[in-house]
Interface confidence: low
């Protein structure tokens, strides 16, 4: 899977969309998780309704919400009040029993609020010592990592 970058402004909302094959994933719940390091586990943040037929209902964990258009095949994650510590790598997942298929790998980048006193060019990306707590963050800009870009920067 390529990594798709979603950029949002600090304090605002970011919407992450994860398209999928609605036939292949029919009947499956979905989840949004935060990647703990390059090869670490993906820590569950929020998942869709326990009853798949009610997946369209929005579910929240803190300021992260998830909803699933099971007919159209689009999982949408909304992250409100975006903060620097929300920057990092995430995954949209499709659940099947104890298995989890990755629908999309996502890099969330947090841009400084241009109305803030800080340099408007500030950009937070995940760091080695970043704590991986629940994400608190929805879509303004998205792109795929270019070939050759390193999704997880090497650690010293």
């Amino acid at each position: 899977h390529n990594t798709t970058v979603f950029q949002g402004v600090e304090g605002q909302s970011l919407q992450v969309s994860c398209p999928y094959d609605s036939m292949k994933h029919w009947g499956r719940r979905k989840a949004w998780c935060r990647q703990l390091g390059e090869k670490g586990p993906c820590q569950r943040v929020v998942s869709t309704h326990n009853l798949w037929l009610l997946s369209f209902l929005r579910r929240r964990n803190g300021s992260t919400a998830i909803t699933d258009d099971t007919l159209g095949g689009t999982l949408t994650i909304t992250l409100r009040n975006l903060q620097p510590h929300d920057a990092g790598f995430y995954q949209c997942q499709s659940l099947h029993g104890s298995e989890a298929d990755t629908l999309r790998k996502v890099l969330v980048e947090v841009l400084a609020d241009p109305l803030d006193h800080r340099d408007a060019g500030d950009l937070w990306v995940p760091g080695e010592s970043e704590s991986f707590e629940d994400a608190h963050v929805e879509h303004s800009i998205s792109r795929s990592l270019l070939e050759g870009e390193i999704p997880f920067p090497p650690t010293s």
């Epitope: 094959d21 719940r29 009853l51 099947h96 298995e99």
Partner: antibody
Framework: QVQLVQSGAEVKKPGSSVKVSCKAS????????MNWVRQAPGQGLEWMGR????????NYAQKFQGRVTITADESTSTAYMELSSLRSEDTAVYYC????????????????WGQGTLVTVSS | DVVMTQTPLSLSVTPGQPASISCRSS???????????LHWYLQKPGQSPQLLIY???NRFSGVPDRFSGSGSGTDFTLKISRVEAEDVGVYYC?????????FGQGTKLEIK
């Protein structure tokens, strides 16, 4: 109607590989999981793995990991199962089987099966 | 892996009489979406397996209504209300809630 037609019987030497084909017709091949199940003589059924032809996604039983490769050719609606490093214990009938879908939710049951391909491993 | 255990392993029944096969799984087969993916197959002599019951209690198309399935969680049952000569073969329960999919050892049904 749905049909799964498998390739003919094979006799193989220990250490060699075998590739069994399964040609599907009568349904949307790309959007249903295809499974491979084997049955040793006088024994029960054993699931080997599956493929989703639409994107090539596969899952394998741990027992066969590294020895089995399941592929699919969407252009010919054909699934393949290749088993390498054959040993006498691999002598079995190999079946392909499609996963049934029914709404709401997938049933994940194998509703149509191929006729089976007997693979005999003998020196 | 989920282990499926069937009882009895063989069954001899007089035509017209009922038959019952039990299947127990080593862990719950309730999927996170609320469905239970427990199925029953029949393999008649010299044939490929055929689907009888899917998701615990749903008869597959063309399956006579003398076949019924029930159960929940880890305990499931296949019942044949009146056995007929054409019902001979090996019955397998199977789960597809978790990968890898697994089958029971099979129950051989014979006619007395």
């Amino acid at each position: 109607q749905v049909q799964l037609v498998q390739s003919g019987a094979e006799v193989k030497k220990p250490g060699s590989s075998v590739k069994v084909s399964c040609k599907a017709s009568g349904y949307a091949f790309s959007s249903s999981w295809m499974n491979w199940v084997r049955q040793a003589p006088g024994q029960g059924l054993e699931w080997m793995g599956r493929i989703y032809p639409g994107d090539g996604d596969t899952n394998y039983a741990q027992k066969f990991q590294g020895r089995v490769t399941i592929t699919a050719d969407e252009s010919t609606s054909t699934a393949y199962m290749e088993l390498s490093s054959l040993r006498s214990e691999d002598t079995a009938v190999y079946y392909c089987a499609r996963l049934l879908r029914n709404q709401p939710g997938e049933s994940y049951a194998m509703d149509y099966w191929g006729q089976g391909t007997l693979v005999t491993v003998s020196s | 892996d989920v282990v499926m255990t069937q009882t009895p392993l063989s069954l001899s029944v007089t035509p017209g009489q009922p038959a019952s096969i039990s299947c127990r799984s080593s862990q719950s087969l309730v999927h996170s979406n609320g469905y239970t993916y427990l199925h029953w197959y029949l393999q008649k002599p010299g044939q490929s397996p055929q689907l009888l019951i899917y998701k615990v209690s749903n008869r597959f198309s063309g399956v006579p209504d003398r076949f019924s399935g029930s159960g929940s969680g880890t305990d499931f049952t296949l019942k044949i209300s009146r056995v007929e000569a054409e019902d001979v073969g090996v019955y397998y329960c199977s789960q597809s809630t978790r990968v890898p999919y697994t089958f029971g050892q099979g129950t051989k049904l014979e006619i007395k």
